[in-house]
């Protein structure tokens, strides 16, 4: 008895795809080994078709996949696109080679069913309408006319020309005549339930005169399309219900046993395991809309249904869409903080991951609000304006090559709290969503400026210090003069070697940036942080307004000013004469081509300063002891 | 709520052939699995035969002791899945469950159904 187990037989007709679930004992060794699927020839051998190292045959090419599942030890071989060759003996095992460990599986293709010629064969999915149609001779023009199913040797009226009407397709038939037409009548039968598949016999006229013609309803249950995942990466459903139901509530709903529970509907229905992680997007006027989930959980695999009607729930004959999704736990994307805790005044750095392949790519921060069908305002990006209500406070660290980007928000509020999506404007899968909690602060933040009322006055020369605890003391201090483009980070100056942290002086760690003479354009937000290597972490910032020296203001030595500064026993100072370039960014339009839930913020009408790179600062100031 | 009903029980002889039909009532999906299994007193309930179809698509599995002795099949227009077996043998013997699913999983695994029928027995006599 092989421990490979699977289907033995699997039927299927000309045209349609097959899933082959193959289930192999839970070993380690199982689940890192070659799979196969290969077909078993009149001579013994059997030619691999695929293979989860890599290999497609030509007769697979484009048509067939083969996806490992280690998590439940199985495996999946997908083939589309069926014809009559492909009946045959199959196996699927495990192994370097096809004589290991396998299971047979037979495989039968079928052309589409025939019917006596006299038959007319109409094929419908769910939901939707079909139209019979029926001939009759002249001499039964004003017969009566009808049309019943067979059930065994006996036809059920369904509707007939003297408004007689099933009960159980009642407001669902009509039967009519169109323009002057007197051979033809029609029965159309709306919202096609399963039960309504079999013969119809339409009829006019009564005994040996009577004109007869069958007609074959087939009534399609959506067969659904599957959709492999990767965990924390994302998916996007699309859904086409047609233009007859451009107008009804649209729904996506998870099959939970016989029901389906709606996971988010255009009336505003949400499941909650879904928050933050959610869009739903109409496409066009026409019924088509998407469904995207990002942050894929494992509890997340199942049958979906899309589907519309004017409740936004499922209901049973309305048209649908199926797909099963399937979730990969052996995921490329990396796991990453999924809930970020910050306090009112203080900040949070934000590490968002994403395909290493694509350092080129450029990267987005939206803030996911759950109004009406849910949407994603960009607040910051790599070549992004930031959204007003931002500036100052918000900043996008880009490390090429790492595989991540940095988000930095400070200045926290309560109102910050919320959802966020991490995203570029390559490989989509890579979304990340974080949950960010704001609580109310307890304690004085750990990172404080003075002076806090950050006045400069052209022409003079400008210091702010930035103070920071001893468990900052191993950590890279830096100030940054804060754009529309980023946080461009100051030259900086350390003199002499520090003292031991043993003996750090909680009271006085300051880093000190000087601005020498100050210029106009030195106006704007500052940020000081600290960082360890491309790992950024606490930040705080200050606004330094600059204003004309009005006459008869004293003028402000520069010994006096960093007089502070120089007493200061571990101190780092900077300085700084930064120039900006003007220059307007905008975002890429190509990056959610087809996903306008995630709104642009680069389309602002207004023209934004981004700075350059910062020169390089002469004549620090400031000691170390 | 789906309902399934076993039916088609009864004593035969070894050698002999039964016909067991499952009917299933209530709302269906278009993908679903329905499974045989059968218990023999004081045992545990053992997989025979399953069924599951997406679409067009139909899939069957079988217990390695009853492959070509037992079919499975589905019968649309009357919402059934009929189990025929032929050459039963004493060891056949037991009461006959259904259970249905819509989800994919593994068809041996009794875990696998949502729903399930009340059993039919059958007993083969030598």
């Known amino acids: 008895q092989s421990p490979i187990f699977g289907p033995q037989d699997v039927s299927s007709i000309e045209g349609n795809s097959v899933s082959i679930t193959c289930y192999y004992p839970d070993t380690s060794v199982n689940r890192h080994t070659r799979k196969y699927w290969c077909r078993q020839g009149a001579n013994g051998y059997c030619a691999t078709l695929i293979s989860s190292n890599g290999y497609l045959s030509k007769e697979y090419s484009g048509r067939a996949s083969l996806i490992n599942f280690p998590e439940n030890s199985t495996f999946v071989i997908n083939i589309a696109h069926l014809t009559q060759e492909d009946t045959g003996s199959y196996k699927c095992g495990l192994g370097t080679t096809n004589r290991g460990l396998f299971f047979d599986v037979s495989l039968e293709v079928s052309q589409v069913p025939e019917f006596p010629n006299d038959t007319h064969v109409y094929t419908k999915d769910i939901g939707r309408t079909v139209t019979i149609e029926c001939r009759f001779k002249e001499g039964n023009a004003h017969s009566k006319k009808s049309l019943c199913k067979k059930r065994g040797e006996a036809c059920e009226v369904v509707i007939d020309s003297t408004e007689y009407v099933d009960p159980s397709y009642k407001d669902r038939a009509i039967l009519f005549m169109k323009g002057t037409s007197r051979d033809i009548f029609y029965v159309n039968i709306s919202h096609l339930i399963p039960s309504d598949a079999g013969l119809y016999v339409c009829q006019a006229g009564e005994g040996p005169s009577a004109d007869k013609n069958n007609a074959d309803l087939q009534v399609l249950e959506p067969e659904p399309e599957l959709l492999y995942k990767d965990l924390r990466s994302s998916v996007t459903f699309e859904c086409d219900l047609g233009r007859e139901v451009a107008n009804d509530a649209k729904y996506l709903c998870r099959k939970n046993k016989e029901t389906c529970d709606v996971i988010i509907n255009t009336l505003g229905k949400r499941d909650p395991a879904f928050e933050g992680r959610i869009l739903l997007t109409p496409r066009d006027d026409n019924g088509r809309f998407s469904v995207l989930i990002t942050g894929l959980r494992k509890e997340d695999a199942g049958h979906y249904q899309c589907g519309a009607h004017s409740s936004g729930l499922p209901q049973e004959g309305w048209p649908v869409q199926a797909w099963q999704l399937f979730v990969n736990e052996e995921s490329t994307i990396p796991n990453s903080r999924s809930v970020v805790k910050g306090v009112t005044g203080g900040s949070v750095a934000i590490v968002c991951p994403y395909n290493p392949k694509e350092s080129s790519s450029l990267k987005y921060w939206c803030h996911w609000e759950a109004d009406e069908n849910g949407r994603c305002p960009v607040l910051v990006g790599t070549q992004a304006l930031v959204q007003e209500g931002y500036e100052g406070r918000l900043a996008l660290f880009d490390q090429p090559g790492s595989g991540a980007y940095t988000v930095i928000l400070n200045q926290l509020t309560t109102q910050d709290s919320g959802f966020y999506w991490c995203l570029t404007d390559g490989d989509s899968r890579w979304r990340t969503t974080i949950e960010l909690q704001v609580a109310e602060a307890t304690k004085k933040p750990d990172l404080e400026v003075t002076p806090q009322n950050a006045t400069a006055v052209i022409g003079e020369t400008f210091t702010i210090s930035c103070h920071y605890p001893c468990k900052f003391y191993s950590q890279e201090k830096y100030w940054c003069k804060w754009s529309n483009d980023g946080c461009h980070i100051l030259p900086s100056h350390d003199e002499g070697a520090r003292q031991s942290s043993v003996s750090c002086d909680q009271s006085s760690q300051i880093v000190s940036m000087t601005l020498n003479p100050v210029k106009k354009e030195d106006e704007g937000w500052y940020w000081c942080g600290v960082k360890e290597g491309q790992v950024y972490g606490e930040t705080t910032a200050i606004y330094v307004a600059v204003e004309e020296r009005t006459r008869g203001s004293p003028h402000i030595n520069p010994t006096d000013a960093n007089a502070r500064a120089k007493d200061a026993p571990e101190e780092e100072a900077m300085e700084s004469s930064v120039r900006e370039d003007e220059n307007k960014a905008n975002l890429d339009p190509r990056l959610f081509a087809d996903e306008r839930e995630i709104q642009n913020a680069g389309d602002q009408a207004q023209e934004n300063r981004a700075s350059g790179n910062a020169g390089s600062a002469g004549g620090q100031s400031g000691s170390s002891k | 709520e789906v309902q399934l009903v076993e039916s088609g029980g009864g004593l035969v002889q070894a050698g002999g052939s039964l016909r067991l039909s499952c009917a299933a009532s209530g709302r269906t999906f278009g993908s679903y699995s329905m499974g045989w299994f059968r218990q023999a007193p004081g045992k545990e309930r053992e997989f025979v035969g399953a069924?599951?179809?997406?679409?067009?698509?139909?899939?069957?599995y079988y217990e390695d002791s009853v492959k070509g002795r037992f079919t499975i099949s589905r019968d649309n227009a009357k919402n059934t899945v009929p189990l025929q077996m032929n050459s039963l043998k004493p060891e056949d013997t037991g009461v006959y469950f259904c259970?249905?699913?819509?989800?994919?999983?593994?068809?041996?695994?009794?875990?696998?159904?949502?729903?399930w029928g009340q059993g039919t027995l059958v007993t083969v006599s030598s």
């Open positions: 259970g249905g699913t819509m989800e994919r999983r593994d068809p041996r695994r009794t875990s696998a159904y949502d729903y």
């Open positions: 069924i599951s179809w997406s679409g067009s698509s139909t899939y069957k």
